[in-house]
Interface confidence: low
């Protein structure tokens, strides 16, 4: 039951967090956590990399023309997120949600 609840909350909140709080003032901890999540789980976006198109930061001039954060890159270099190309972007089917689900299943059951 706990797993089901956690799973539901993750699905509901991860996209909101990524789109509204990533790289926003006062949300440095969230930004760092999302970057770490994408790098450690080799994923990009909540459901897929396209989710980042809705991000306030990605839409702003502060993003420097990136279409995804640099933490989506397989090899992270400055501004690597400007090219949303499978050769260097984690294009995992199901995005970070799927990776997190798997992790939770393995560690909480």
């Amino acid at each position: 039951a706990y797993y089901q609840q956690l799973n539901t909350e993750l699905k509901e909140n991860l996209k909101d967090t990524m789109t509204k709080r990533y790289h926003q003032p006062g949300h440095e901890a969230v930004t760092s956590a999302v970057d770490q999540l994408q790098q450690e789980f080799h994923c990009c976006g909540s459901n897929n990399s396209q989710d980042w198109r809705d991000s306030e930061w990605i839409r702003s001039q502060e993003a420097g023309g990136r279409v995804v954060p640099d933490s989506c890159c397989k090899t992270v270099v400055a501004l690597c997120g400007q090219r949303d190309h499978a050769s260097n972007i984690y294009k995992v089917e199901g995005g970070c949600i799927t990776k997190l689900e798997t992790f939770i299943q393995e560690h909480l059951r």
């Epitope: 909101d16 702003s60 001039q61």
Partner: antibody
Framework: QVTLKESGPGILQPSQTLSLTCSFS??????????VSWIRQPSGKGLEWLAH???????RYNPSLKSRLTISKDTSRNQVFLKITSVDTADTATYYC???????????????WGQGTSVTVSS | DIVMTQSQKFMSTSEGDRVSITCKAS??????VAWYQQKPGQSPKLLIY???NRYTGVPDRFTGSGSGTDFTLTISNMQSEDLADYFC????????FGAGTKLELK
């Protein structure tokens, strides 16, 4: 079918507080991605964005008016409110509310607008 | 704030004309630009979003183009019902609108 309708006092005096209500149907602010903005337009002039409220109660304000603005919502009643303190004749305008669906196909554009409510500040 | 400049306040047109309304952003806004049409006594209506995407039900004579700082709304075959004010808007950061361009008959 999405509809929005603004209501307000019509006329008020300088230094008073303007209270506006946006009543909407066809969507709910409990849905992720939904947001409502307030925009105003003095007669014969351009549009000025005032404030925005997100589904999760996060708020954004026009920096030049921020100290005078308060936006809020009643999700259960499908209403969004805007208060403007210390009004002046320069606040005379038609006030619109508009929907923004952040996760929809139309990105952050304002896809549905209310008919507007006319507000006159006069002594 | 990002300033959106519509340099033409008024444009004289005739039916059948090709009309181009321009809008310039004071800084790079990517493609985060929308265009609205407003007829007298009415609220604005969304025509174009993400710089070049036509909103549902908008006739295909309306076309949006541009990215970065320069944007254009083109009406390829001007109709009398297109006489209205047209506003550009950026939503790269806090939304700001252009001052508007009014289409009039010659």
């Amino acid at each position: 079918q999405v509809t929005l309708k603004e209501s307000g006092p019509g006329i008020l005096q300088p230094s008073q507080t303007l209270s506006l209500t946006c009543s909407f149907s066809g969507f709910t602010l409990s849905t992720s991605g939904m947001g409502v903005s307030w925009i105003r337009q003095p007669s014969g002039k351009g549009l000025e964005w005032l404030a925005h409220i997100y589904w999760d109660d996060d708020k954004r304000y026009n920096p030049s008016l921020k100290s005078r603005l308060t936006i809020s919502k009643d999700t259960s009643r499908n209403q969004v409110f805007l208060k403007i303190t210390s009004v002046d004749t320069a606040d005379t305008a038609t006030y619109y509310c508009a929907r923004r669906d952040h996760y929809g196909d139309y990105s952050y554009a304002m896809d549905y607008w209310g008919q507007g409510t006319s507000v006159t500040v006069s002594s | 704030d990002i300033v959106m400049t519509q340099s033409q306040k008024f444009m004289s047109t005739s039916e059948g004309d090709r009309v181009s309304i321009t809008c310039k952003a004071s800084q790079n806004v990517g493609i985060a630009v929308a265009w609205y049409q407003q007829k007298p006594g009415q609220s604005p209506k969304l025509l174009i979003y993400s710089a070049s995407n036509r909103y549902t039900g908008v006739p295909d004579r309306f076309t949006g183009s541009g990215s970065g700082t320069d944007f254009t709304l083109t009406i390829s075959n001007m109709q009398s019902e297109d006489l209205a004010d047209y506003f550009c808007q950026q939503y790269s950061s806090n939304p700001t609108f252009g001052a508007g361009t009014k289409l009039e008959l010659k």
